[in-house]
Every structure is written in C-alpha cells, then in structure tokens.
C-alpha cells in the first residue's frame, strides 16, 4: 500500500496582522489509524495549535467539514493574526496508541512570517 505522506505545499506564508491565515496540509492515506494535530515549532517545547479531540482553540477553524467522511485535508485557518503568531507550523500524524498516541510522521512545515502592510 502507499506509505503516508504529509503534504504542506507552502514553505513560506506571508500574512498580515489582523487578517486570517490558511495553513494547508493534506495526507495521502487514511492509514495508519490516528489523529492529525497542528504544532508551532519542534521538540518538547513546541506549541499545540489545534487538536480536534480536546482543547479550546477559539481562533482556529478547519477548512474541511468536521463531518466529512474519509477526509484527507487537514488544513486550518487562524484568524486575527498578530506578530506573536509568526513561526513554523507543522501538521503531524499520530498513530493511535493505548493509552497514548505516538507521533508517526510530520509535514515539512510552513513558515508564517509577517508581510508588508497593504498601502
């Protein structure tokens, strides 16, 4: 079978303060079983940006309908961008575990940076 790939097509995303940013992530397989989460940064200090299962992320919405069957689009939108939002964002596939899920594969990351303000 096809091995799962995590596709984040944009290496760099220039955003404007106050606007909404869309971070794209698609997967090539439904397997292995387990969730996709979004993080900013890498390593133990990385920040969880979105987990559909738990947590409260009022500025984050999903691009795809949460009731869509066999979805492979895990893109998100972040509203009301501020300078504190800059950084590199990763979508990460976890393999279902019991009791803990295990990180399986990460996308290559999308760097979010501030672009020039529109004149």
């Amino acid at each position: 079978e096809e091995e799962l790939q995590m596709i984040q097509p944009e290496k760099l995303l220039l955003v404007t303060v106050g606007k909404t940013a869309t971070l794209h992530c698609t997967v090539t397989s439904l397997l292995p079983v387990g969730p996709v989460l979004w993080f900013r940064g890498v390593g133990p200090g990385r920040e969880l940006i979105y987990n559909q299962k738990e947590g409260h992320f009022p500025r984050v919405t999903t691009v795809s309908d949460l009731t869509k069957r066999n979805n492979m689009d895990f893109s998100i939108r972040i509203s009301s961008i501020t300078p504190a939002d800059v950084g590199t964002y990763y979508c990460v596939k976890f393999r279902k575990g019991s009791p803990e899920n295990v990180e399986f594969k990460s996308g290559p990351g999308t760097e979010m940076a501030l672009g020039a303000k529109p004149s």
Epitope: E1, E2, S29, L30, L31, P32, V33, G34, P35, V36, Q52, K53, T62, S64, D65, L66, T67, K68, R69, N70, N71, F74, R95, K96, S98
Partner: antibody
Framework: EVQLLESGGGVVQPGGSLRLSCAAS????????MTWVRQAPGEGLEWVST??????YYADSVKGRFTISRDNSKNTLYLQMNSLRAEDTAVYYC???????????????WGLGTLVTVSS | EIVLTQSPATLSVSPGERATLSCRAS??????LAWYQQKPGQAPRLLIY???IRETGIPARFSGSGSGTEFTLTISSLQSEDFAVYYC??????????FGGGTKVEIK
C-alpha cells in the same frame, strides 16, 4: 458494491484454535482500517479487534489470544483465534472502518457473520 | 472505557407512531457517535454517524441528535421494516470501541 464475506467459523473445543477470514470486494481494501465485531447468542455487539496498516488493536478480553492480520494482495482480513473459551462463542462479523474527518472510526459496511461455537 | 447506556431496553410502538431511543455516555464523546439497526439473523446496518448525519440511503424518518453525553435516535413514523434492535457506538475514545446494550423496538 461493497461486499464482505466471512468464513472459517465452526465448532471447536475449549483451548482449540480457529482462523476466520473475510474476503472484501468493491472498495480499495488497502486504504481502510478493518474491524472484527462479535455477538454472543442473544446478546449485544462487542468490538474485538481493528487493524490499520501495521497497527493493531484488541479488546482486553481477547488480547494475547487473538491475532488480527490482513493480506492486501488478496483483499482479505483474518482473525487467528487461539486458546478459545466458551465465552468466545459468538457470531463474528468483519466490518469496514470509515473515518469522520478529524475524528474516530465507525463501521459503514458489515459482513453477514460466521458462527464460532466453543464447546466440549 | 466509555460506557454507553441505552434506554429503554424495549420500546413497544404502533406502526405510524414516533419512536425515541436514548443513548447516554459515561463521559463526553462530543459528536463521535453512530447508530446501527440490526434485524434478526442479519448484520448491523449503519444509520447515523457523527451523532446526526444520516448514512446514504437511510430514509429521512431516521434522525439523530445530541452531543456530549446525551444522544437520541428518532424514528418519526415507524414502518413495519423498522422493527429491529438499535445500537449506539462511540468512537471518541478507543480502544475499546464500545456499543450500547441495544434497544429493541417491537410492535405494540
């Protein structure tokens, strides 16, 4: 049309073994997780085991005794059942998993089931 | 393990009447709940997923509602072919996937 056809059930003595098969057709078998669910006579549904690609999951009641596997080249799901007990007597259904977006799995297609009877 | 409790165990309804089936979860499962119908000697059939989404081909008289810990399956006007056992299943937190004990809808 999705079809799932179980086979391999029968009567076996306590402590014995059986291997169930589920032949799948009508969908891209290798792309989906697959599950075994059982139903004891006159009782409700009980999840047994699920397999993704290499990832496998078991109910506590069968862990260490049952092994789920798949052969994607044959579009076939298997359940190897060892050290069988009287309480394993049930109709065993194979089911295709379907995932809701960012969430978990439910079962959108089921086979007709195969009866396993464990009795001396 | 999340426990699903279905009530009532048996529901006696006349054809054409409304049937309301309940499924209560021991903890929050958000909308990660499915409903199945099973007739004697047959395999279960998916009716509803994501608590409220009707599976393709399922008649509009079947509807699901609720979220969190309280869920309802409603059959607006029972037809003869609807007399069966109905199970709920949660997929929020697994393993294990868990099913309710079932509600038998019988002819009054």
């Amino acid at each position: 049309e999705v079809q799932l056809l179980e086979s391999g059930g029968g009567v076996v003595q306590p402590g014995g073994s059986l291997r169930l098969s589920c032949a799948a057709s009508g969908f891209s078998f290798s792309n989906f997780a697959m599950t075994w669910v059982r139903q004891a006579p006159g009782e409700g549904l009980e999840w047994v085991s699920t397999i993704g690609s290499g990832d496998t999951y078991y109910a506590d009641s069968v862990k260490g005794r049952f092994t789920i596997s798949r052969d994607n080249s044959k579009n076939t799901l298997y359940l190897q059942m060892n050290s069988l007990r009287a309480e394993d007597t049930a109709v065993y259904y194979c089911a295709k998993d379907s995932t809701v977006s960012w969430s978990g799995d439910f079962f959108d297609y089921w086979g007709l089931g195969t009866l396993v009877t464990v009795s001396s | 393990e999340i426990v699903l409790t279905q009530s009532p165990a048996t529901l006696s309804v006349s054809p054409g009447e409304r049937a309301t089936l309940s499924c209560r979860a021991s903890q929050n499962v958000k909308n990660d709940l499915a409903w199945y119908q099973q007739k004697p000697g047959q395999a279960p059939r998916l009716l509803i997923y994501a608590a409220r989404i009707r599976e393709t081909g399922i008649p509009a008289r079947f509807s699901g509602s609720g979220s969190g810990t309280e869920f309802t399956l409603t059959i607006s006007s029972l037809q003869s072919e609807d007399f069966a056992v109905y199970y709920c299943q949660q997929y929020y937190d697994w393993p294990p996937f868990t099913f309710g004990g079932g509600t038998k809808v019988e002819i009054k």
